[in-house]
C-alpha cells in the first residue's frame, strides 16, 4: 500500500501477489469525514489503472473486478473527485503478478583447483517477475551437509566456499537447489558426484622449453602441475598458424619430449590436466609459451640466374642473381652467400661472400670456361650450392623459342606463351623467363626477375613485380645442356596513352633531307610499351592536314630522317608516341627551314 | 535490502526545470516499478509517475507532459526530467521501488518553485 493513506484505503483480495491469469477484486473505501464537504453524498470514487481510469462510483466506497493483468507490477489508484476542485489522491495499491519458479535444471559443480571451493551453477528457466530466492544443499558422508543462500535477483551460481579433500576420492556428494518465491517454490533434481567428478584442476604453470645442445631434434616442454593430476595435452603451433597439433600424454610428471617441430620458428605452447582417465573435466589451458626453435642448417639450393654483358675485346661482365630460400629451407638467418667463381681449364677459382644482396657482378676475361657456385650460410652450416655453366645463353639460334606473345592477364599480370624451338624440341630442358623493368639506357642497375618452367610447357604467368603501366622487357630462354636459345618481346600488364610526346632536342641539315633528334619520353610517362613514334609536320601559317611519319619503337632509337621537305619553306614540326591503348598529346614544336635547292 | 538516494532538487523560478535522480543499491530493482511520489506542506504522499521493468511509464494527470521519467538498469538509477514547473508542484520528492515483501523509500528531496 502506498504509505499514510490519510483520506482512505484501498484494499487487494485474495492477494496483492497473483499468479498470471488470476483475477483480484480491489476496493477503495473513505475515512469518515474524509469525502466531500457538504456534499457527502456526491463523492465520486475513480480508480486509475497507473494514469488509466477504470472505474468510478459515487459513494463512500468502490468495488472493482480486475482481470488480465500482465506480469510485473501494476499500480492502482483511488481518487476522489468533488464538485469544482480537482481530483484528490486517496490511496493506491501495486498488484504483483507473476509466476512461481521453474524446476531448476542442468545443476553442475566444480572445484577449481585441489584448494579450490565448490561452486554449483544451473539454469533458472524462465523469469518469475517476482523476487525468487535460490537455497544450494550439499550433503555428504557421514550426514554433513551444508547449505547458502542467494539473494540476487537473477541468482544461477553459488560457491559453498567450502573445500573437497581427496581423503576419500570415491565418497559420494549430493548437490540440490531449491527456488522459492511467493506463488511456489521448485527444486532441482539432485545431482550426485565425487571428488574426482567436480576437482578442475588449475591450468599447468611455470612452462619452460629446452634444446639440447641447440637442437631441434631434442626438444623437452617442461611444466609444473597440481599434485594428482595424471593426464595432460599439449596443444602447440607455429606462430602464425591457426592449426594446433595436439598431444595426449599420461603419467608425463611436468615433462615431454617434442620431435616434431621445424627449425628456427617460433612456436606457442599450451598444456591443460586431468586427474582422472574418464572422470572429471580438464583444465583451462595454461597461458601460452612463446619459444623460438634453434637453427638447422639450410636445405635446398639456391635458384640462381645470371646476365652476361660484352665489356670490349678481351672482357665480359657477369652479373649472378639468386632468390631468397624460402623460411623452411633456410631453418635460420642467413648469414651470408658464399659465390665461387671458377675457371674450368685453368682450375683458377675465387670464393666470395656476399652479405645484404643476393645479386653479385664480376669482370671475367672472354676466353675460357667459367663456372659458378653458390650457396646460401646460417649459423649452423650452408646449403648445398647450386652450380651453373656461364655460356652465351642466345646463342644457339635453332634453340631460341618462337612466337613469344606477352597478353595482359588480369590486375599486374602478363602471360608468356611461346612454341618450342624447331631444333628438336625434346632437347629442351627447362625454360626460363625473364622479365625487368625496360629502361631505355639498358640500365644494368634494373631488378631482374625470372621463373623457371618445365621443358614440356608453353606458357607462364608473370606476376612477382610487375606493376602497372610500366613495359616490361621479357625474354623466353630454352636451356640444353651447355647452350641456349632466347627470344624477346616487350610486355605490360595494363597501358594507356602516354602522358607526354617526344621531346625534339636537334633538327639537321643533311644534303637536302632532315634529322630530326628526340629526348625519350621519361619511363613513368610511357604507360606501357611504345609500339610507334610519329612525326608530324606542316607549313607554318597553312590551315592543311600536317603530314606524317610512322616509325616502328626501337628502345635505343633517337633520330630519324625525313627527306619531303621542301627547300626554302619554313615548317612546324612535333612528335608523339603510341602505345595499343593510344596516342599521346603533341611534344613541343619546332620551326624548321631548310637552306638546300629545289630538286 | 534496497536502499535510495534521491538527488537534483532546488530553488527554481516558474517555468524552469529541474532533473531529479535516484539511484539504489541492489540488483533485485531492475525486475520492479520504479516510482515518483511527492509530499506538499500539510498534504499526504501522492503518486506523480511510474516506469515498469520494461521501461512502459506513466504519469499522474498533473504530471503529464510536463514531467518525464526514464531509467538506466545498468546503473540502478531512475530519473524525473522536470520541465516548466509551477508553484504547486513545490514538495518533497520521493523515489520508491515497491516489492511484493514491501515498499522502499528515499529520504527525499525538496523542490521549490517560486512564482
Known amino acids: 500500500k502506498i504509505d499514510a493513506c490519510k483520506r482512505g484505503d484501498v484494499t487487494v483480495k485474495p492477494s496483492h501477489v497473483i499468479l498470471l491469469g488470476s483475477t483480484v477484486n480491489i476496493t477503495c473505501s473513505l475515512k469518515p469525514r474524509q469525502g466531500c464537504f457538504h456534499y457527502s453524498r456526491r463523492n465520486k470514487l475513480i480508480l486509475y489503472k497507473f494514469d488509466r481510469r477504470i472505474n468510478f462510483h459515487h459513494g463512500h466506497s468502490l468495488n472493482s473486478q480486475v482481470t488480465g493483468l500482465p506480469l510485473g507490477t501494476t499500480l492502482f489508484v483511488c481518487k476522489l473527485a468533488c464538485i469544482n476542485s480537482d481530483e484528490i489522491q486517496i490511496c493506491g495499491a501495486e498488484i504483483f503478478v507473476g509466476v512461481a519458479p521453474e524446476q531448476p535444471q542442468n545443476l553442475s559443480c566444480i572445484q577449481k583447483g585441489e584448494q579450490g571451493t565448490v561452486a554449483c551453477t544451473w539454469e533458472r528457466g524462465r523469469d518469475t517477475h517476482l523476487y525468487t530466492e535460490y537455497t544450494l544443499q550439499l550433503s555428504g558422508p557421514k550426514n554433513l551437509t551444508w547449505q547458502k543462500q542467494c539473494k540476487d535477483i537473477y541468482c544461477d551460481y553459488l560457491d559453498f566456499g567450502i573445500n573437497l579433500t581427496p581423503e576419500s576420492p570415491e565418497s559420494n556428494f549430493t548437490a540440490k537447489v531449491t527456488a522459492v518465491n511467493s506463488l511456489g517454490s521448485s527444486s532441482s533434481l539432485p545431482s550426485t558426484f565425487t571428488f574426482l567428478d567436480i576437482v578442475r584442476p588449475l591450468p599447468p604453470w611455470d612452462i619452460r622449453i629446452k634444446f639440447q645442445k641447440a637442437s631441434v631434434s631434442r626438444c623437452t616442454l617442461y611444466w609444473r602441475d597440481e599434485g594428482l593430476v595424471l593426464l595432460n595435452r599439449l596443444r602447440y603451433r607455429p606462430s602464425n598458424s591457426r592449426l594446433w597439433n595436439m598431444v595426449n600424454v599420461t603419467k608425463a610428471k611436468g615433462r615431454h619430449d617434442l620431435l616434431d617441430l621445424k627449425p628456427f620458428t617460433e612456436y606457442e605452447f599450451q598444456i591443460s590436466s586431468k586427474l582422472h582417465l574418464y572422470k572429471g573435466s580438464w583444465s583451462d589451458w595454461s597461458e601460452s609459451l612463446r619459444a623460438q626453435t634453434p637453427e638447422e642448417e639450410p636445405t635446398g639450393m639456391l635458384d640462381v640466374w645470371y646476365m652476361k654483358r660484352h665489356i670490349d675485346y678481351s672482357r665480359q661482365q657477369i652479373s649472378l642473381f639468386w632468390k631468397n630460400l624460402s623460411v623452411s629451407e633456410a631453418r635460420g638467418k642467413i648469414l651470408h652467400y658464399q659465390v665461387t667463381l671458377q675457371e674450368l681449364t685453368g682450375g683458377k677459382a675465387m670464393t666470395q661472400n656476399i652479405t645484404g644482396h643476393t645479386s653479385w657482378t664480376t669482370v671475367i676475361p672472354r676466353t675460357g670456361n667459367w663456372a659458378v657456385a653458390v650457396s646460401a650460410a646460417n649459423s649452423k652450416g650452408s646449403s648445398l650450392p647450386t652450380r651453373i655453366n656461364i655460356m652465351n645463353l642466345c646463342e644457339a639460334g635453332l634453340l631460341a623459342p618462337r612466337q613469344v606473345s606477352a597478353n595482359s592477364e588480369g590486375m599486374d599480370n602478363i602471360l608468356v606463351t611461346w612454341q618450342p624451338p624447331r631444333k628438336d624440341p625434346s632437347a629442351v630442358q627447362e625454360y626460363v623467363v625473364e622479365w625487368r623493368e625496360l629502361h631505355p639506357g639498358g640500365d644494368t642497375q634494373v631488378p631482374l626477375n625470372w621463373l623457371r618452367s618445365r621443358p614440356y610447357n608453353v606458357s607462364a604467368l608473370i606476376s612477382e613485380n610487375i606493376k602497372s603501366y610500366i613495359c616490361y622487357e621479357i625474354r623466353v630462354y630454352a636451356l640444353s645442356g651447355d647452350q641456349g636459345g632466347c627470344s624477346s618481346i616487350l610486355g605490360n600488364s595494363k597501358h594507356k596513352a602516354p602522358l607526354s610526346g617526344p621531346h625534339i632536342n636537334a633538327i639537321t641539315e643533311e644534303k637536302g633531307s632532315i634529322l630530326i633528334s628526340w629526348n625519350s619520353i621519361p619511363v613513368q610517362e610511357q604507360m606501357g610499351c611504345l609500339l610507334h613514334y610519329r612525326i608530324y609536320w606542316k607549313e607554318r601559317d597553312s590551315n592543311s592536314q600536317p603530314q606524317l611519319c610512322e616509325i616502328p619503337y626501337r628502345v635505343s632509337q633517337n633520330s630519324h630522317p625525313i627527306n619531303s621537305l621542301q627547300p626554302r619553306v619554313t615548317y612546324v614540326l612535333w612528335m608523339t608516341a603510341l602505345t595499343a591503348a593510344g596516342e599521346s598529346s603533341h611534344g613541343n614544336e619546332r620551326e624548321f627551314c631548310l637552306q638546300g635547292k629545289a630538286n | 535490502q534496497v536502499q535510495l538516494q534521491e538527488s537534483g532538487g532546488g530553488l527554481v523560478q516558474a517555468g524552469g526545470s529541474l532533473n531529479l535522480s535516484c539511484t539504489a543499491s541492489?540488483?533485485?530493482?531492475?525486475?520492479?516499478?520504479m516510482d515518483w511520489y511527492r509530499q506538499a506542506p500539510g498534504n499526504q504522499r501522492e503518486w506523480v509517475a511510474s516506469?515498469?521493468?520494461?521501461?512502459?511509464?506513466y504519469y499522474d494527470g498533473s504530471a503529464k507532459g510536463r514531467f518525464t521519467i526514464s531509467r538506466d538498469n545498468a546503473k540502478m538509477t531512475v530519473y524525473l526530467q522536470m520541465n516548466s514547473l509551477k508553484p504547486e508542484d513545490t514538495a518533497v520528492y520521493y523515489c520508491?521501488?515497491?516489492?511484493?515483501?514491501?515498499?522502499?523509500w528515499g529520504q527525499g528531496t525538496q523542490v521549490t518553485v517560486s512564482s
Open positions: 520508491k521501488v515497491p516489492t511484493e515483501n514491501g515498499n522502499y
Open positions: 541492489g540488483s533485485i530493482i531492475s525486475i520492479y516499478n
Open positions: 516506469i515498469t521493468s520494461n521501461g512502459d511509464s
